[in-house]
Interface confidence: medium
């Protein structure tokens, strides 16, 4: 069967910056900002796009040693990320995979809402353990808050990039960070 769990959470961080840090660079950030939750992330195959397989290892003392995630979709425009847990962790005799969708939506106050959908694909008529859903939710919350704290403490990290016109750059068009933009306009 398929059991769907949906939740929402808020962040004070703007959507574009959060997507860049939490989703696109989570592999590097998570072990750095939340070593108590994730010890390492390694790419088994792929370059981060759809089809990429990642192995996420957990520190000793947590219930599972590792999980393998498969990236299914990365939508940079709509800040959407789909992936599936396909091996390790709770995957086994009763659970085939967990399909996850994270969408980060900008809010008028400059923060964001994360809309999260977790679909548990069980084998036969097995049900999902409530504690598994709770543990997964808590892990997500731990990672999000750790990334959020990092971003609050490092205001220059993962800033949105702006496309500067050829005119502004004297015929050269390129992606430029806000920090570079500040520098460019003052020199």
């Amino acid at each position: 069967g398929v059991f769907n769990y949906e939740t929402e959470t808020t962040s004070v961080i703007p959507a574009a910056r959060l997507f860049k840090a939490f989703i696109l660079d989570g592999d590097n950030l998570f072990p750095k900002v939340a070593p108590q939750a994730i010890s390492s992330v390694e790419n088994i195959e792929g370059n981060g796009g759809p089809g990429t397989i990642k192995k996420i290892s957990f520190p000793e003392g947590l219930p599972f040693k590792y999980v393998k995630d498969r990236v299914d979709e990365v939508d940079h425009t709509n800040f959407k990320y789909n992936y599936a847990v396909i091996e390790g962790g709770p995957i086994g005799d009763t659970l085939e995979k967990i399909s996850n969708e994270i969408k980060i939506v900008a809010t008028p106050d400059g923060g964001s809402i994360l809309k999260i959908s977790n679909k548990y694909h069980t084998k036969g008529d097995h049900e999902v353990k409530a504690e598994q859903v709770k543990a997964s939710k808590e892990m997500g919350e731990t990672l999000l808050r750790a990334v959020e704290s990092y971003l609050l403490a490092h205001s220059d990290a993962y800033n949105e990039q702006k496309l500067i016109s050829e005119e502004d750059l004297g015929g050269e068009q390129k992606l430029i960070s806000e920090e570079d933009l500040h520098h460019h306009h003052h020199h």
Partner: antibody, heavy 120, light 107 residues
Framework: QVQLVQSGAEVKKPGASVKVSCKAS????????MHWVRQAPGQGLEWMGW????????NYGQKFQGRVTMTRDTSITTAYMELSRLRSDDTAVYYC?????????????WGQGTLVTVSS | DIQMTQSPSSLSASVGDRVTISCRAS??????LNWYQQKPGKAPKLLIY???NLQSGAPSRFSGSGSGTDFTLTISSLEPEDFATYYC?????????FGQGTKVEIK
């Protein structure tokens, strides 16, 4: 430990404005939304709005739009709520409240309250 | 706006009694329901969040249940310090709204 300390009681005339402050300590100020909730004498609780303390963006309850302004000063970890064009029915205790930062807007920590009396 | 209706509006009970307070939402709010305790002249205190989760520091005699539109706060065995007013609050959609309160008085 987390503390929210509000400014003292105010007495205002109808038509005037009042600005209430809420000094936060014991946590990362910018990581949490700050909400304002009021309670008229002998009445229930009424949510007025929030401020995103990181971006400064606000979300006001429709009832208060156009009359309320929420601001913050991150350098002194203080949030402010200003209510203009006061009427007698704005007489209430005004609370600031910090959210819990879980998957839900929950008012986990509250200031001690500021009594605002509107009287001619 | 979502209306929150509590019942009863007040009740009298004795120390040691089991007390239940109901809260009904005007539409489905899933489990986005929180309970607060307020004593006279004091700020409210969070007791239960997300319908059934006990806030850290809140006594274990308090419990919450329900989902959708109907919710219950239960005090398993009333203590003298539990005489107060209790409010439910929905955080499913803006504006966040509270119930009108239930005052628990000494019999």
């Amino acid at each position: 430990q987390v503390q929210l300390v509000q400014s003292g009681a105010e007495v205002k005339k109808p038509g005037a404005s009042v600005k209430v402050s809420c000094k936060a300590s014991g946590y990362t100020f910018a990581a949490h939304y700050m909400h304002w909730v009021r309670q008229a004498p002998g009445q229930g609780l009424e949510w007025m709005g929030w401020i995103n303390t990181y971006t400064g963006g606000t979300n006001y309850g429709q009832k208060f739009q156009g009359r309320v302004t929420m601001t913050r000063d991150t350098s002194i970890t203080t949030a402010y709520m200003e209510l203009s064009r006061l009427r007698s029915d704005d007489t209430a205790v005004y609370y600031c409240a910090r959210d819990r930062r879980n998957w839900n807007f929950v008012f986990e920590y509250w200031g001690q309250g500021t009594l605002v009396t509107v009287s001619s | 706006d979502i209306q929150m209706t509590q019942s009863p509006s007040s009740l009298s009970a004795s120390v040691g009694d089991r007390v239940t307070i109901s809260c009904r939402a005007s539409q489905n709010i899933k489990n986005y329901l929180n309970w607060y305790q307020q004593k006279p002249g004091k700020a409210p205190k969070l007791l239960i969040y997300e319908a059934s989760n006990l806030q850290s520091g809140a006594p274990s005699r308090f419990s919450g249940s329900g989902s959708g539109t109907d919710f219950t706060l239960t005090i398993s065995s009333l203590e003298p310090e539990d005489f107060a007013t209790y409010y439910c609050q929905q955080s499913f959609s803006i504006p966040w709204t509270f119930g009108q309160g239930t005052k628990v008085e000494i019999k």
